[in-house]
Amino acid sequence: APGPVPRSVSLPLTLKELIEELSNITQDQTPLCNGSMVWSVDLAAGGFCVALESLINVSGCNAIYRTQRILHGLCNRKAPTTVSSLPDTKIEVAHFITKLLSYTKQLFRHGPF
């Protein structure tokens, strides 16, 4: 699990990098992370920390390694919380990435920095 509070990162710049990375991933036609499934989470309620807590359970997937890194930088929570998953709902990583991309774009357009 991720460790202590990371040093500060430039939020607008990091969000832009995350959008670029997620966009690249969604354009890749190969099955993402060999079809691994993750918990669907309420991004609006939990933000990048719950996204990280869900994606952190995906192992050995180079395609989302940079996404995991960026999310770790964006999530400055000291300790992981329980994933606020939608009851028993698992979705493919590819679907999760699409949802995360939409959320990040929305935040980038409207979020206060």
């Epitope: 952190i56 192992s59 995991q68 890194r69």
Partner: antibody
Framework: QVQLQESGPGLVAPSQSLSITCTVS????????VNWVRQPPGKGLEWLGM???????VYNSALKSRLNISKDSSKSQVFLKMSSLQSDDTARYYC????????????WGHGTSVTVSS | NIVLTQSPASLAVSLGQRATISCRAS??????????MHWYQQKPGQPPKLLIY???NLESGVPARFSGSGSRTDFTLTIDPVEADDAASYYC?????????FGGGTKLEIK
Amino acid sequence: QVQLQESGPGLVAPSQSLSITCTVSGFSLNAYSVNWVRQPPGKGLEWLGMIWGDGKIVYNSALKSRLNISKDSSKSQVFLKMSSLQSDDTARYYCAGDGYYPYAMDNWGHGTSVTVSS
Amino acid sequence: NIVLTQSPASLAVSLGQRATISCRASKSVDSYGNSFMHWYQQKPGQPPKLLIYLASNLESGVPARFSGSGSRTDFTLTIDPVEADDAASYYCQQNNEDPRTFGGGTKLEIK
């Protein structure tokens, strides 16, 4: 509990090729990354390369032309092939796994000793 | 490639004292506010064992006598207090950039 075990030839003649197999138990290779690391007698560790669970392969740039890493996920085996061996390739060869982010090598095999000699 | 330089190459520390090992990277191993530097211990005849990940996080089961610190290019592994069982070689390793690289190692002797 993830376990890794290397098996190799022990002795290789100069200019010949080396083939080592790493058998992984306790985790599917579709979702597990395996590294190859070697250690010459009395010396330090040298990272050779790795294969990610999703198939991406990365090599040590200095050895790239001599290395080939592959896997058979159905048999839970990862393979290291190294060509044109010389005496300075004599080393203990380890496979090491990193399951989850941040992908530090948290599981190691015991290694297999390879001697290059005629 | 990122070159990791460890110092000293060897050191002897008295039982109960503090051991400090340094690892310097030829360029930053930080990414998005985290340091992708890890530390391993290797005892004679055994494979390496992960001690510390992401510069300062203790791997499960590793005694709290071990600690890691640092960022960007300068990192430190500290063992305090040193015990007889800590006689081993210690290696830093980065995975911020491919190819991954190891430091040259530091051999710790207990006096």
